[in-house]
């Protein structure tokens, strides 16, 4: 059974999310469960470090993009949100909070501002931003 969920403030169009927890979960209350991942969008604006702390306080991390297939709902995300991707100036690479390196061809990185943090935007785009800039953020929790 699939539920047609239309969340105007989160997605650009209708997103199909399973109704019953037997397909996915468990997740914290009111979080979105999709293909063995739990997601929550937070409307309050925080800088990257505060966003990271907020996710950690809920036993989660900032959004990690690891698969266009498993995370296809991210294609439709509205606006821009902090994700857990940071630039490592010493070697020029981009890595996730868990230390893993950004896989090639997973995100299109666009240098909009000077900074070492990245905002997630629809269609798997990452916009470089100043880490101290307040913005909304996405927390994520793996269910398996």
């Amino acid at each position: 059974i699939w539920s047609a969920v239309f969340l105007n403030s989160l997605f650009n169009q209708e997103v199909q999310i399973p109704l019953t927890e037997s397909y996915c979960g468990p997740c914290p209350k009111n979080w979105i469960c999709y293909k063995n991942n739990c997601y929550q969008f937070f409307d309050e604006s925080k800088n990257w470090y505060e966003s990271q702390a907020s996710c950690m306080s809920q036993n989660a991390s900032l959004l990690k993009v690891y698969s266009k297939e498993d995370q296809d709902l991210l294609k439709l995300v509205k606006s821009y949100h902090w994700m857990g991707l940071v630039h490592i100036p010493t070697n020029g690479s981009w890595q996730w909070e868990d230390g893993s390196i950004l896989s090639p061809n997973l995100l299109t990185i666009i240098e909009m501002q000077k900074g070492d943090c990245a905002l997630y935007a629809s269609s798997f785009k990452g916009y470089i931003e100043n880490c101290s800039t307040p913005n909304t953020y996405i927390c994520m929790q793996r269910t398996v």
Epitope: K78, M112, K114, E129, N130, N135
Partner: antibody, heavy 121, light 109 residues
Framework: QVQLVQSGGVVVQPGGSLRLSCAAS????????MHWVRQAPGKGLEWVSG????????GYADSVRGRFTISRDNAKNSLFLQMNSLRAEDTALYYC??????????????WGQGTLVTVSS | SSELTQDPAVSVALGQTVRITCQGD??????ASWYQQKPGQAPVLVIY???NRPSGIPDRFSGSSSGNTASLTITEAQAEDEADYYC????????????FGGGTKLTVL
């Protein structure tokens, strides 16, 4: 194509009020930050105010803070600027403008044709 | 609030390279956007972000940044490049606010 159509020019007395409007088309209005930018005759560009896609973030230039109010109606694809306590130095061409970003200020990629506001007795 | 400073006027010989600069504290944290404005017309975005050009903007326009200075470079300047050029960036307060430079009048000789 992107269009930002603004209301016509007007003359208003010092101390008076005025509401500017801007009708947007050709893009998803509620995906972007919008701004008002003004240009006094023969002068440079001055940012006046900006508002994020969901109205959560609003900013004003020091010169207009407390007198001007920006707002938007996403259902009607419209941007507004309520101008109160107008002064002679507010005389300018006012541009409605679209940002590259939804929440932040990344730069303006489209501009309206401008509305000339003249504050004079 | 921040201030961005531009030279009021710059000239360049036809076909030569010219650099227009913009200085301000906010440019240590943020990239500048650049706009071209011709008399009686609305401004046109020519550079944004690190060095991004909107579609339709010739590749002779490029942007760069170092410290508190942003630069717009026009290589092989054409007669139609004669215009006023404005830089702008986010205010150094980190809020939603923006700030514009005073503008540079470019004359192509």
């Amino acid at each position: 194509q992107v269009q930002l159509v603004q209301s016509g020019g007007v003359v208003v007395q010092p101390g008076g009020s005025l509401r500017l409007s801007c009708a947007a088309s050709g893009f998803t209005f509620d995906d972007y930050t919008m701004h008002w930018v003004r240009q006094a005759p023969g002068k440079g560009l001055e940012w006046v105010s900006g508002i994020s896609w969901n109205s959560n973030k609003i900013g004003y230039a020091d010169s207009v803070r407390g007198r001007f109010t920006i707002s938007r109606d996403n259902a009607k694809n419209s941007l507004f600027l309520q101008m109160n306590s107008l002064r002679a130095e507010d005389t300018a061409l006012y541009y409605c403008a679209k940002d590259l970003s939804a929440m932040l200020s990344w730069g303006i990629d489209y501009w309206g044709q401008g509305t000339l506001v003249t504050v004079s007795s | 609030s921040s201030e961005l400073t531009q030279d009021p006027a710059v000239s360049v010989a036809l076909g030569q390279t010219v650099r227009i600069t913009c200085q301000g504290d906010s440019l240590r944290s943020y990239y500048a956007s650049w706009y071209q404005q011709k008399p009686g017309q609305a401004p046109v975005l020519v550079i944004y972000g690190k060095n991004n050009r909107p579609s339709g903007i010739p590749d002779r326009f490029s942007g760069s940044s170092s410290g508190n200075t942003a630069s717009l470079t026009i290589t092989e300047a054409q007669a139609e490049d004669e215009a006023d050029y404005y830089c702008n960036s986010r205010d150094s307060s980190g809020n939603h606010d923006m700030v514009f430079g005073g503008g540079t009048k470019l004359t192509v000789l």
